[in-house]
Amino acid sequence: LQDPCSNCPAGTFCDNNRNQICSPCPPNSFSSAGGQRTCDICRQCKGVFRTRKECSSTSNAECDCTPGFHCLGAGCSMCEQDCKQGQELTKKGCKDCCFGTFNDQKRGICRPWTNCSLDGKSVLVNGTKERDVVCGPSPADLSPGASSVTPPAPAREPGHSPQ
């Protein structure tokens, strides 16, 4: 025998109290698949969370973070504070990058500058707390008489992955 509940579509639940009739999910609840015996409570985006997508009868709400914070975890389960570029977030708060390291993002930790000499190149632009070193041509190419090199216009630096 076919389970009568299997006929209940997403957005409804199989109501045992009403002869297994398909009833719509109550307000602030949803069912994303058919045949469910209960509806799930909608996620509420409160505090540092803000609503990215409202809850509907067939799908949960989706949250992201208010400005100054970024998402962590599947489905943005946590909001973590941003730091400034040139800083990293330690367990004790935001801290400036040490000499020889940089961070061009508002999250993550400080990354060591590129060592141009390892690829046989020279330093064209020194690094800062916010920017990596820019490597130029190899030192041999900079001998007298070698044509000068114009650095290319900076492209977008690697950025945030969507959560």
Epitope: E88, N103, T114, D132
Partner: antibody
Framework: QVQLVQSGAEVKKPGASVKVSCKAS????????MHWVRQAPGQGLEWMGW????????NYAQKFQGRVTITRDTSISTAYMELSRLRSDDTAVYYC?????????????WGQGTLVTVSS | SYVLTQPPSVSVAPGETARITCGGD??????VHWYQKKPDQAPVLVVY???YRPSGIPERISGSNSGNTATLTLSRVEAGDEADYYC????????????FGGGTQLIIL
């Protein structure tokens, strides 16, 4: 969807060089650092180095400095790892892996791996 | 020091809880990531930044980190969890930015 597809298996003689490629698709290749990690038979994972595909800036583990070169061709969304002066203990599976957009997080997408066998 | 120490193996019965440790000096000040590695497959990120799961990783996998030890916990272990697990940390040092632990083989009894 994000995909990293690596070149096929290689067999090399000691002293030779090998160049492994990693073609990226499904995202903005220039926007995310690419890392290389290897695993020798019966051994653990070992980080080798990274490249910023946007600038070409690199960093290598000290163990490999002078033998490894990581490059990229942004026009075909491909990163390369070249290892020179190969020894038998360089026999390993070599993986490319994408950093998720900032330094200090886990590597979120990996290539399928390329087996490099070094044998005389 | 840039050494992360893991036990070579951990054995657990199906349905039980497995705990895999990763030791390192003041590792609690770092952000630890965990990868699952099965034979002939690429590693899979299962926990990042101490305790966060990427999409698609089941809730029974969790992580914690304090003091000198980070821990990956797998509850209600299944046969499909049998794999090697590696912890990993990024440093700001130019010579050793990326360091992996030696790996732990999870054996399902």
């Amino acid at each position: 969807q994000v995909q990293l597809v690596q070149s096929g298996a290689e067999v090399k003689k000691p002293g030779a060089s090998v160049k492994v490629s990693c073609k990226a698709s499904g995202y903005n290749f220039s926007g995310y650092y690419m890392h290389w990690v290897r695993q020798a038979p019966g051994q653990g994972l070992e980080w080798m180095g990274w490249i910023n595909p946007n600038s070409g800036g690199t960093n290598y583990a000290q163990k490999f400095q002078g033998r490894v070169t990581i490059t990229r061709d942004t026009s075909i969304s491909t990163a390369y790892m070249e290892l020179s002066r190969l020894r038998s203990d360089d026999t390993a599976v070599y993986y490319c892996a994408r950093e998720p957009g900032y330094y200090g997080s886990g590597l979120d997408y990996w290539g399928q791996g390329t087996l490099v066998t070094v044998s005389s | 020091s840039y050494v992360l120490t893991q036990p070579p193996s951990v054995s657990v019965a199906p349905g039980e809880t497995a705990r895999i440790t990763c030791g390192g000096d003041d590792i609690g000040d770092k952000r630890v990531h965990w990868y699952q590695k099965k034979p002939d497959q690429a590693p899979v990120l299962v926990v990042y930044e101490d305790r966060y799961r990427p999409s698609g990783i089941p809730e029974r996998i969790s992580g914690s980190n304090s003091g000198n030890t980070a821990t990956l916990t797998l509850s209600r272990v299944e046969a499909g969890d049998e794999a090697d697990y590696y912890c990993q940390v990024w440093y700001s040092s130019p010579d050793h930015p990326g360091v992996f632990g030696g790996g732990t083989q999870l054996i399902i009894l």
